[in-house]
């Protein structure tokens, strides 16, 4: 599509908008130079134009009065200072703080639970299809197919651990070689990064918040995609991951360890198992070509079963099929053998909502998908609101400084590595990179964590999830120990390699630049975020999957020209930004291309036409749905909800009143009140510290 959005006649200027090192402290925006982010193009009121979306490579001359949109907002305190309060006020403030903390933890709990249920919903909707992806025999010979299968399966089941465990069981059963499994693991790494991208979509209501949240989430995507882009060809050529991990596995005499500690699951499971319980073995069985599993439901019905082993006589085609020569006989017509049969006797049903409904998996999955997304969205909004009211003034300053400030010179470079360790540790504690990165996303959105700091935390999260896998591997039974350990180590070394590629040298931190570029685009054209999600996690993998099935020739025939065009565009962009004089005048900018090929504006018009019908209604829906609607309709006052429809009608009559951007207010809570998102409250009663 567009090489980048709207670059018209822009002249490159390499000196502007370069990212600083991780942890750089950006200055607060000057209130006098505020940008209006409402995007009401036809309003009669004079306002400063929206920032154009900057790409990662093209650096544009901009009016000096416009602030860097990546600067963190100042969360100023408008409440009464602690010292000025009377005893009653202090007590009230203390209990308010405690209340907020309890609410925050409560919403955080349901947020994590909804992520778990979201994963279950995806498994119910697409789990069986995901299992069938694995039963494709071409995986063995085609690493690219393995990669996209890893992506698609993980996206469909919303869990890299599920897809990885399927791979492990297939390797243990010799249905898959470690060599063929490595690209699948790489794909699973990519697929798992969709969760926090979905979470970022929930913050669509506020442009600047969305810009940061979406960039913060997609930094994970870009890291994974770029790592695969470099490391998959390297692995195919050298098999370095396979060789290193094989040496490690063979050099140690591992004994079966303990199970990986379930720390977060201990708290969330009591609740999530009341909603739905899944029999995840079904997906593995489908992957391993078990025909009977295709008709089984993923919804677990019986939780307490009694397994009785017994021997039964069965007929076999010939004596060669007998269990053993001594367990072989004939009745004169047929050959018989004795087979060990495990009889499963159902004793007690599971205690979850869907146990007695006998609904098809797709129906249960769809219900849970909608509900979990609503809960996820609701919890996220509430977390952001509570954090917004808590993180003000001194509290905000302390937290932001603690998280985003580097160590003193000459140890500043160590800060990022500590963040990697923190990310790994936190992920190990919560046992899920999705949960950790998803929890990080709203914090990036509201401006508590910079993208530069979120990046190493995310990289650490990638490492953390592999250490969990290594522990799980050490706890696996003898026959699966070697293969599961080798695959877990492949996953680990793949992420280490990725970090070595895209982290140590600030210049190589491409994922940050790319994520910021995407954040800018998505903040201006919010529909592009959904478009990105569909393209990168569904369409591209499905296209590669389809082409791979058609055979190598078709894949190469289509792939080579596409790759060639991409390389050509990237080289041209690099030359345009670095040394445009080398190029002929016509190629010094993209004006020679039709508008739809170089700008998202025409596409935006098309999308707006399609979503126009939602504009009148989008804000009249409930507050939770509101944000989802905004994503589609690009409604400027989307989250007012109360007077929104009337305002929209007024706006159409040309009586629009500009809505102040959040940065113009003293703090986030007030900015949201002005936009009608929070019922107006007396800001004097706001409590500044817990």
């Amino acid at each position: 599509m567009a090489p980048w959005p709207e670059l018209g006649d822009a002249q490159p200027n390499p000196d502007k908008y370069l990212e600083g090192a991780a942890g750089q402290q950006p200055t607060a925006p000057d209130k006098s130079k505020e940008t209006n982010k409402t995007d009401n193009t036809e309003a009669p009121v004079t306002k400063i134009e929206l920032l154009p979306s900057y790409s990662t490579a093209t650096l544009i001359d901009e009016p000096t009065e416009v602030d860097d949109p990546w600067n963190l907002p100042t969360l100023q305190d408008s409440g009464i200072k602690w010292s000025e309060r009377d005893t009653k006020g202090k007590i009230l403030c203390f209990f308010q703080g405690i209340g907020r903390l309890i609410l925050l933890l409560g919403f955080l709990y349901f947020f994590v639970c909804s992520l778990d249920i979201l994963s279950s919903a995806f498994q119910l909707v697409g789990g069986k299809m995901a299992g069938q992806f694995f039963s494709n025999s071409s995986i063995m010979s085609n690493p690219l197919l393995g990669l996209v299968i890893g992506v698609l399966v993980t996206v469909l089941v919303q869990s890299s651990s599920t897809s990885t465990s399927i791979v492990v069981s297939m390797v243990s059963s010799s249905l898959l070689t470690v060599r063929a499994a490595i690209p699948i693991i790489m794909g699973a790494n990519i697929g798992t990064s969709i969760t926090n991208t979905i979470v970022a979509l929930m913050q669509v209501g506020d442009r600047s918040e969305f810009r940061r949240a979406f960039a913060g989430a997609t930094v994970h995507d870009f890291f994974n995609w770029l790592s695969v882009l470099v490391l998959l060809p390297v692995e195919v050529a050298t098999h370095y991951l396979e060789i290193i991990t094989q040496l490690i596995v063979e050099s140690f005499h591992f004994k079966n360890g303990e199970d990986a500690p379930d720390l977060l699951k201990v708290i969330t499971k009591p609740f999530t198992k009341l909603i739905v319980q899944l029999d995840k073995k079904v997906i593995s069985q489908i992957a391993m070509n078990d025909e009977k599993a295709k008709n089984k439901s993923l919804v677990k019905i019986w939780c307490k079963t009694f397994t009785n082993k017994t021997q039964i006589n069965v007929t076999v085609p010939s004596t060669a099929n007998c269990t053993s020569p001594s367990l072989c006989w004939t009745d004169g017509i047929q050959n018989w053998t004795m087979k060990n049969v495990t009889y499963k006797e159902n004793i007690a049903k599971c205690q979850h909502i869907f146990v007695n409904f006998h609904l098809p998996d797709l129906a249960v999955g769809t219900i849970l998908l909608i509900l979990s997304l609503l809960v996820l969205c609701g919890c996220l909004i509430m977390i952001v609101k509570i954090l917004g009211s808590v993180l003000k003034g001194q509290v905000a300053t302390v937290i932001k400084k603690t998280i985003n400030t580097d160590f003193p010179f000459p140890f500043a470079w160590l800060t990022g590595y500590l963040a990697i360790l923190v990310g790994a540790g936190m992920t190990f504690i919560v046992q899920s990179s999705s949960v950790f990165t998803s929890a990080l996303t709203p914090l990036i959105g509201i401006g508590v964590i910079t993208i530069e700091r979120a990046y190493p935390l995310t990289l650490g999260s990638n490492i953390g999830t592999t250490t969990t896998a290594i522990l799980a591997a050490l706890a696996s039974p003898g026959n699966a120990l070697r293969s599961s350990l080798q695959i877990a180590l492949c996953h680990f070394f793949f992420n280490i390699s990725g970090i070595l590629l895209w982290y140590p040298i600030p210049f190589t931190r491409l994922p940050i630049r790319m994520a910021k570029g995407l954040g800018n685009i998505s903040a201006k054209y919010r529909w592009f975020a959904v478009f990105y999600l569909i393209i990168f996690f569904f369409l591209i993998p499905l296209t590669v999957f389809g082409l791979s099935l058609a055979g190598w020739r078709v894949l190469v025939g289509v792939g080579v020209p596409v790759v060639f065009i991409i390389i050509l565009v990237l080289c041209l962009r690099l030359l345009q930004s670095r040394c445009p004089r080398v190029l002929p005048k016509k190629l010094q900018n993209w004006n020679f291309l039709p508008l739809w090929m170089r700008s998202l504006k025409p596409w935006d018009a098309v999308v707006s036409k399609f979503t126009g019908c939602f504009q009148m209604r989008c804000c009249c829906c409930c507050r939770v749905c509101c944000r989802a609607c905004c994503l589609l309709c690009d409604c400027p006052k989307c989250c007012r909800c109360s007077k929104c429809c009337e305002d929209l009608e007024e706006a159409q009559e040309g009586q629009d009143v500009p809505v102040k951007a959040p940065e113009t207010f003293d703090n986030i809570t007030i900015s949201r009140e002005a936009q009608g998102e929070v019922p107006a409250s007396d800001s004097k009663t706001e409590c500044t510290a817990l």
Partner: antibody, heavy 120, light 107 residues
Amino acid sequence: QVQLQQPGAELVKPGASVKMSCRTSGYTFITYNMHWVKQTPGQGREWIGAIYPGSGDTSYNQKFKGKATLTADKSSSTAYMQLNSLTSEDSAVYYCSISTIITTGAVDYWGQGTSVTVAS
Amino acid sequence: DIVMTQSHKFMSTSVGDRVSITCKASQDVGTAVAWYQQKAGQSPKLLIYWTSTRHTGVPDRFTGSGSGTDFTLIIRSLQSEDLADYFCQQYSRIPLTFGSGTKLEIK
């Protein structure tokens, strides 16, 4: 009770064929496999083959393939064995028998045997 | 084909004796062995199947043992009505095969 009735004796000319019967009663004919066993003083006992009357499935000892043909008539609950191109070596007592011990080849009910004599 | 060998064609015994009749298979037949008794002028009668399981109505003085290739039929205290021809049969593989038989005689 289970009974298997066989004709006492058959005298046949060399090169001719004989079809001996085994009339059953006291059980459901189609339930159990019907076995045929040859007994001679010199060769001892030899298993000829078996038929499952329910489906008509048969199984033969390789040695008797082409020599013996096993059939079953469900309507009369009778099993038959036809022996072709008889020679003096085919002179023997032929037993029909069934195995009611399901899934085994252990034969628990036997007919009285038909003595076949091949002589010109 | 599996060959069932009964080494003794005849055995001289007395009433009240403990008699052991042996049968050797040419290959492993597991426990798929049956023992029969055949009196002169009569049809065979099943005594034991699955090496050691007595058939209905068979006196408990008859016991079977063995597995794989070596099998034994033991008559604990021989009665006069037990004088007959005893033969083994394997039903491990098709064709079913029989032992040549061991005839018990009074000394």
